[in-house]
Interface confidence: medium
């Protein structure tokens, strides 16, 4: 199948293409004679001296020293098979279904799968990961403790782009009207700390109160926002006079 062994082209002697056609289009053999199915991601390619590209558009044939078992086995593509097709663009893309795909090739594969199920084709909306509004991964938990104690609330959020996390103290006025006070404000017994992670596009924030006073009792809201939306979760800090006043649920200790 290399160029120096190519005889005259005899289309009648070419092996037939699959009756249902080639999913990724057709290409020609190394001699430029017989039509054959273009190869997809992970499929064997690159046999023959001329090394005519057997890979589908958007893919390239990458030489593989070690043949991957079950992907390009000894018999996989006939003599001279020396590589596998990989996606040229190996960056994530966002599909019209809201899913982030590792590459455009995988998006195209997902689109074909969707169409084969009678669903709408998936198109590329943008390069990079899909944007998504924030969501609360781990909300803060209610805390009961005595005055003078050191307590903290934590909150873990995720979103794309990575959300901005702030803390508010919720103040409920008359007739159910509520207003929020952005923390830390001017309180010197209260500190806010925020860091990225633990996962990509996640943010974790803490409110540290030390020493705890009666004025610190109330509802604290963790609020996350990005260009796609916002999310919030809240927890209460209850200040008691003595440890024995802290209610203990059966089988668990109080959050101190």
């Amino acid at each position: 199948s290399s160029s120096d062994t190519c005889g005259p082209c005899e289309p009648a002697s070419c092996p037939p293409l699959p009756p249902l056609g080639c999913l990724l289009g057709e290409t020609r053999d190394a001699c430029g004679c017989c039509p054959m199915c273009a190869r997809g991601e992970g499929e064997p390619c690159g046999g023959g001296g001329a090394g005519r590209g057997y890979c589908a558009p958007g893919m390239e044939c990458v030489k593989s020293r070690k043949r991957r078992k079950g992907k390009a086995g000894a018999a996989a593509g006939g003599p001279g098979v020396s590589g596998v097709c990989v996606c040229k663009s190996r960056y994530p893309v966002c599909g019209s279904d809201g899913t982030t795909y590792p590459s455009g090739c995988q998006l195209r594969a997902a689109s074909q799968r969707a169409e084969s199920r009678g669903e709408k084709a998936i198109t590329q909306v943008s390069k990079g990961t899909c944007e998504q509004g924030p969501s609360i991964v781990t909300p803060p938990k209610d805390i009961w403790n005595v005055t003078g104690a050191q307590v903290y609330l934590s909150c873990e959020v995720i979103g794309i782009p990575t959300p901005v996390l702030i803390w508010n103290k919720v103040k409920r006025g008359h007739y159910g009207v509520q207003r929020t006070e952005l923390l830390p404000g001017d309180r010197d017994n209260l500190a806010i700390q925020t860091r990225g992670g633990p996962e990509k596009h996640e943010v974790t924030g803490w409110v540290l109160v030390s020493p705890l006073s009666k004025e610190d009792a109330g509802e604290y809201e963790c609020h996350a926002s990005n260009s796609q939306g916002q999310a919030s979760a809240s927890a209460k800090i209850t200040v008691v006079d003595a440890l024995h006043e802290i209610p203990v649920k059966k089988g668990e200790g109080a959050e101190l």
């Epitope: 699959p18 056609g21 999913l23 499929e43 992907k71 018999a75 996989a76 593509g77």
Partner: nanobody, 128 residues
């Protein structure tokens, strides 16, 4: 030699569901290098192609007779291909066969002659 063994057939009421399995085995048989298909053979009819899946499992194809009520899938680690059949009708009564064709190309194969290995079949009977 290569063996394909279907299972999961049986008697089911109209509107019911079945999940057929096809386990492949054989020395030096690399299941993940094979495209797989399901066919059925009803008495007095030709063997009918139903659905196919590429070697990687990335692509699936369904004929109109089962589209929207069946799902083909494969587990290359278990050397098994599956066919989930839903909303079964009496006309689905047949012997169901799985078949394998060596192919590491993204293409579907729909004709009996293209497939190299066949199972013994499993009977599916749909009663009204």
């Amino acid at each position: 030699s290569v063996q394909l063994q279907e299972s999961g057939g049986g008697l089911v009421q109209t509107g019911g569901s079945l999940r057929l399995s096809c386990a492949a085995s054989g020395r030096s048989f690399t299941f993940s290098s094979y495209a797989m298909g399901w066919f059925r053979h009803a008495p007095g009819k030709e063997r009918e192609f139903l659905t196919a899946i590429t070697w990687s499992g990335d692509y699936t194809y369904y004929t109109d007779s089962v589209k929207g009520r069946s799902t083909i899938s494969r587990d290359n680690a278990k050397n098994t291909v599956y066919l989930q059949l839903n909303n079964l009708k009496p006309e689905d009564t047949a012997v169901y066969y799985c078949a394998a064709k060596f192919s590491q190309v993204s293409a579907f194969f729909a004709t009996v002659s293209e497939y190299e290995y066949w199972g013994q079949g499993t009977q599916v009977t749909v009663s009204s």
